[in-house]
Each structure stands twice: as structure tokens, then as C-alpha cells.
Interface confidence: medium
């Protein structure tokens, strides 16, 4: 051929037209061309229809061609690989109808700022998708639904700040995920699903270490040997895993997998995400309960006492173990008080007046003071119905989970909790007038009701707040029957789900510290 090099290897006819200053497809290329290289030309725009005569074309390289537009018309029925990298495309062409057999699509280093929901529709054979080095900020939730055979996905070096929770749903063959060098601050719960992901690249993101990160932390712990640092030019299989490369941005580059997360509810591990419940692992010494460790659980119903200490906090960061460097959108709160003010390790708390009634009592609740939101049992956010459940029942007692095995195993997503947990012995009766209370918005600070046993000797009991403690003595709610040793229990008020989508508001309800 006068312009391009033609070579035949086995059954492949390869035509190399790289670096020829071409502005269009050269004429008279061999009709049985299977691999066509058009890299580093000045095509600017290109129509795939011009390639329709080449019915055996399986690979097309259009990288570094200053492409601003790719016209998709006609059909290239056997084209398997399309390289569009290092161009100037601002939108991803809808390739599904034109390239039904496509298995590898590389659109790295273009100028994509967003992808439409149906961007990959019709690409059911796609196995590798490379979108590295674009300007993507978000992704549509069902983006990868049409590509169930996907094995490799690169979203590295974009401006992604968040990922849709179900992005990887159904991608059972996915073995490599490149998310490094983005602006991700958290990974949504359940994001990785239950299938094994052998190669994950997650470094170079400003991970915000607070309670919202716990699902991701747990996944990192269980998949430590599958987390790698990207090295240009090194084969993935030759790289060494490095889970410590995933670091907290707000805490001195602390590895996320070691983030202590003290006082957080077990968002990463538990199905119920409605209320706090504290179950200390106990050593009994006479009539004292010595709390040595705390596992934080979520029952689906409230249980509180006729006596209560209320306190609330602002929505700024309460991640008090790392107060010195906050996320850019978070503000530092100056006022911090411990709760109770002098509650320190090995302090014995005597509260003679507190009694736990063995029989549940149903009492109406007085109107709370304007500064606090009314305590209302909220539904667990992962339930299908989101209506408030006005009748509290006694949750099933939960003991501390068994330690995880040392060998990591895929973390399967827990099944959604039933609407009503199995009651122990007697359920508490419904209030006389069950009226669903409007769910507070983000503007309302969450409020916590904490009740205590008559005698607790905690090893460590810090509760950090950012507003002064206030005591609402008249507050009453039902007490479920206690069939276990006395425990410190707490109820989180305020609608957890309402701020779940705002990562800078919701995560900071976390910082009740462990016993």
C-alpha cells in the first residue's frame, strides 16, 4: 500500500497507518484487513461507516488523532477492540448498535465530563472498559448494567467524588478495578458486593475517615492482599499488594484499613442501621458490671428509660480522635465537652435513683423543649418501607459477633432486616395514639438519649459532644423487659437516612465512644 504498511501474521492482516499526518481514512486498504492502526494522525472527526467495507476488522486504533467527534453509523459486526484514547472527545458516542461485538473499549485520556445512563447500551460483550484520565465527576447508577461480562474497569485519574452504590452489581467476572487518583472520600455500603475482586487500585483518593468509611475499612481488611498500587508499565500480576496505600486524607495519611472508628455503629457489618445499642462484653465482679469492650449494634426499635440524659451536637466533625485535619467542607467546632463532664476510665458511676422496671410500661410523652427534636422510633434505612414505626418492640438480644477468621473471605451483604424483629418474651404495647411524626430534616441536629445501669465501672467511657449537656427529666418512653444483665443502652434520634446522602452531615453522628 502506498501510504500504510501491510503485514500478514497467520490469519491476521494488519495495516499500520500510524503517524502519517492523515486527515481521513486512506483509500484502497485491503478489504480483508483485520487490524487497523490509525494512531497519531490528525483526523479531528471520523465516521465508523467508512470502515463498513472491511467486514473482517476486529481491532481499530484511533488513539492520539485529535478526535473531537466520532460518528457512529453503520455496523462493524466483528470489531472487538476500539482504542479511542488520547483524543479530545467530550462525550462518549453510543457505540452499541454499531459495534455489537466490542470486547475492549479504551476512551482513556479524553475530555469526558459525564456519561449518559445508556452510554453502554448494546455492548453486552464488553470485557474491558478504560475511562482513565477524563474529567468524570459522577457516574449514572445503571451505567454498567448492559455489560455483565465486564472484567476490567478503569476509572482512574478522573474527578469522581462519589460512586453509585450499585455500580458493580451483576459484574460477576470483574477482576480488576482501577479507581486510583480520584476525589473519592468514601465507598458506599455494599459497593463491592460479595464476589472476589482480585485487583483493586484505590490509592490517591482523599478518603474521609469517619463512621461512613467503616464498610470500606472492613472490605479492605478482608481483601488486603487484593489492593495494589498502580505502577506504570508493570504488569498487574507482577505488582505487590499494598493495602496501606489507601489512606485517610483527614488524618495524617493513616491507612483506612486501620482506622479505629471508635464509637461508630457497625455500618459496615450489620443489617439494621436504625438505632444504637451498646452491648459491653462483661466481667462481673460481685454486683459490678465491668465493661471491657463494647460492640455497637443496631436494633430496629427504640428502648429507653423514664430517666434520660439528652444531648445534641452540631453536624460538624465529631471524629474526635482526628480533630486536627478536617475535610474541606467540614468546620471545626471549638466547644467540646465530655459527657458526663468528669467521666474518665475506671470511674464508677453510681445512679441510685435509676431503676429498671421488669414490666414494660406505656406512657405518653410530654412535648419536648424546642431545642431538641422529639424522640421517635425511626425505621431502619435499609428496609423497603420508609414509614415510621410507632410501636416499639423489644429487639432480640445480640451478643458480640465472633471474631472474623484470619483468612479474608468475600464479605457478603447482609440480608435486609425484617420490619419487626423477633420479640423476647413480651413485646411492649403500642402507644395509645400512634401518629407518625414527620422525620426531622438535616437542619435538625441528631439527639441521643442515653440511659445507664445503676452501677457501671467502664474501662473507658468517653462520649464527645459539641454542645453542652442538657437534662430533660420529664422525658418518658417505654422500657422493654430486661432479660439480660444490666447494659448501657442508647437511642439515636433524628432520621439517619435523611442525611445519608450528605457525607459531610450524616457520618458524624458516629462518635459515641466505646466502653
Amino acid at each position: 500500500h502506498p501510504i500504510c504498511e501491510v503485514s500478514k501474521v497467520a490469519s491476521h492482516l494488519e495495516v499500520n497507518c500510524d503517524k502519517r499526518n492523515l486527515t481521513a481514512l486512506p483509500p484502497d486498504l485491503p478489504k480483508d484487513t483485520t487490524i487497523l492502526h490509525l494512531s497519531e494522525n490528525l483526523l479531528y472527526t471520523f465516521s465508523l461507516a467508512t470502515l463498513m467495507p472491511y467486514t473482517r476488522l476486529t481491532q481499530l486504533n484511533l488513539d492520539r488523532c485529535e478526535l473531537t467527534k466520532l460518528q457512529v453509523d453503520g455496523t462493524l459486526p466483528v470489531l472487538g477492540t476500539l482504542d479511542l484514547s488520547h483524543n479530545q472527545l467530550q462525550s462518549l458516542p453510543l457505540l452499541g448498535q454499531t459495534l455489537p461485538a466490542l470486547t475492549v473499549l479504551d476512551v482513556s485520556f479524553n475530555r469526558l465530563t459525564s456519561l449518559p445512563l445508556g452510554a453502554l447500551r448494546g455492548l453486552g460483550e464488553l470485557q474491558e472498559l478504560y475511562l482513565k484520565g477524563n474529567e468524570l465527576k459522577t457516574l449514572p447508577p445503571g451505567l454498567l448494567t448492559p455489560t455483565p461480562k465486564l472484567e476490567k474497569l478503569s476509572l482512574a485519574n478522573n474527578n469522581l467524588t462519589e460512586l453509585p452504590a450499585g455500580l458493580l452489581n451483576g459484574l460477576e467476572n470483574l477482576d480488576t478495578l482501577l479507581l486510583q487518583e480520584n476525589s473519592l472520600y468514601t465507598i458506599p455500603k455494599g459497593f463491592f458486593g460479595s464476589h472476589l475482586l482480585p485487583f483493586a487500585f484505590l490509592h490517591g483518593n482523599p478518603w474521609l475517615c469517619n463512621c461512613e468509611i467503616l464498610y470500606f475499612r472492613r472490605w479492605l481488611q478482608d481483601n488486603a492482599e487484593n489492593v495494589y498500587v498502580w505502577k506504570q508499565g508493570v504488569d498487574v500480576k507482577a505488582m505487590t499488594s499494598n493495602v496501606a496505600s489507601v489512606q485517610c486524607d483527614n488524618s495524617d495519611k493513616f491507612p483506612v484499613y486501620k482506622y479505629p472508628g471508635k464509637g461508630c455503629p457497625t455500618l459496615g457489618d450489620e443489617g439494621d442501621t436504625d438505632l444504637y445499642d451498646y452491648y459491653p462484653e462483661e466481667d462481673t465482679e460481685g454486683d459490678k458490671v465491668r465493661a471491657t469492650r463494647t460492640v455497637v449494634k443496631f436494633p430496629t426499635k427504640a428502648h429507653t428509660t423514664p430517666w434520660g440524659l439528652f444531648y445534641s451536637w452540631s453536624t460538624a466533625s465529631l471524629d474526635s480522635q482526628m480533630p486536627s485535619s478536617l475535610h474541606p467542607t467540614q468546620e471545626s467546632t471549638k466547644e467540646q465537652t465530655t459527657f458526663p463532664p468528669r467521666w474518665t476510665p475506671n470511674f464508677t458511676l453510681h445512679m441510685e435513683s435509676i431503676t429498671f422496671s421488669k414490666t414494660p410500661k406505656s406512657t405518653t410523652e410530654p412535648t419536648p423543649s424546642p431545642t431538641t427534636s422529639e424522640p421517635v422510633p425511626e425505621p431502619a434505612p435499609n428496609m423497603t418501607t420508609l414509614e415510621p414505626t410507632p410501636s416499639p418492640t423489644t429487639p432480640e438480644p445480640t451478643s458480640e459477633p465472633a471474631p472474623s477468621p484470619t483468612t479474608p473471605e468475600p464479605t457478603s451483604e447482609p440480608a435486609p432486616s425484617p420490619t419487626t424483629p423477633e420479640p423476647t418474651s413480651e413485646p411492649a404495647p403500642s402507644p395509645t395514639t400512634p401518629e407518625p411524626t414527620p422525620i426531622p430534616t438535616i437542619a435538625t441536629s441528631p439527639t441521643i438519649l442515653v440511659s445507664a445501669t445503676s452501677l457501671i465501672t467502664p474501662k473507658s467511657t468517653f462520649l464527645t459532644t459539641t454542645k453542652p449537656v442538657s437534662l430533660l427529666e420529664s422525658t418518658k418512653k417505654t422500657i422493654p423487659e430486661l432479660d439480660q444483665p444490666p447494659k448501657l443502652r442508647g437511642v439515636l434520634q433524628g432520621h439517619l437516612e435523611s442525611s445519608r446522602n450528605d457525607p459531610f452531615l450524616h457520618p458524624d453522628f458516629c462518635c459515641l465512644l466505646p466502653l
Epitope: K258, P260, K262, C264, R293, T294, V295, E400, P514
Partner: nanobody, 121 residues
Framework: EVQLVESGGGLVQPGGSLRLSCAAS????????MYWVRQAPGKGLEWVSA????????YYADSVKGRFTISRDNAKNTLYLQMNSLKSEDTAVYYC??????????????WGQGTQVTVSS
């Protein structure tokens, strides 16, 4: 039984130094990350520093970076915190804390009783 016993606290003038120690027993010290945390009077709990199992990786809160050094001696089952250029805002009870035994639990696993550090002229 797991025990963490801090020592080395005391009264020191601004700009002075202290070295805190934490003697650990009842668990395989060399298998756990260890942490120093502190609580200033009337303030919340603040994470100060952390060290990995072998001592090769150390982490510090911004407020102490460049002034404090965490280290460990796995042969002696002891954790240390060298505090230099102390400021009045470093006044607090300092606790050493053991890492989690597994990923199902959350929070520091065990704490010492704390040692008081007072920086005052």
C-alpha cells in the same frame, strides 16, 4: 488478662520534654497496632499517634506532628511516646490503646488507666 499500664507523665514547663511508656501484657504485643490518645480537661478524646506492628510505620495527628515520636519495643512489650517542645495545649490525660483483635469489633480494644501530663510554667 489484657493490661496496659502507662507511666512517665508529670508536670513540665512549656518547651520541655517527657517520655511516656506503656507496658503491655496479656496479649501478643507484637501482633497489634498500638495507639496513643489523649483527653484534655473539658475536651473530647483526641487521637495522637499510632504505630504498626513492626514499628516501621508511624502516624501522627497534625497537632503533634514534628514534636512527638511514637515507638515500640516488641521484645519488652512496651510502647513509647517521646514528647518534645511541649505546649500548654498538650496538657491532658494520655492513654495507650490496643488495636482491634478483628474487624467485627469497632473502637480501641483495651485502654490503660492513663497518665496525666501537665504543661505549665
Amino acid at each position: 488478662e489484657v493490661q496496659l499500664v502507662e507511666s512517665g507523665g508529670g508536670l513540665v514547663q512549656p518547651g520541655g520534654s517527657l517520655r511516656l511508656s506503656c507496658a503491655a501484657s496479656g496479649f501478643t504485643f507484637s501482633s497489634y497496632w498500638m495507639y496513643w490518645v489523649r483527653q484534655a480537661p473539658g475536651k473530647g478524646l483526641e487521637w495522637v499517634s499510632a504505630i504498626n506492628t513492626g514499628g516501621g510505620s508511624t502516624y501522627y495527628a497534625d497537632s503533634v506532628k514534628g514534636r512527638f515520636t511514637i515507638s515500640r519495643d516488641n521484645a519488652k512489650n512496651t510502647l513509647y511516646l517521646q514528647m518534645n517542645s511541649l505546649k500548654s495545649e498538650d496538657t491532658a490525660v494520655y492513654y495507650c490503646a490496643k488495636d482491634l483483635p478483628n474487624s467485627d469489633s469497632l473502637g480501641y480494644d483495651y485502654w490503660g488507666q492513663g497518665t496525666q501530663v501537665t504543661v505549665s510554667s
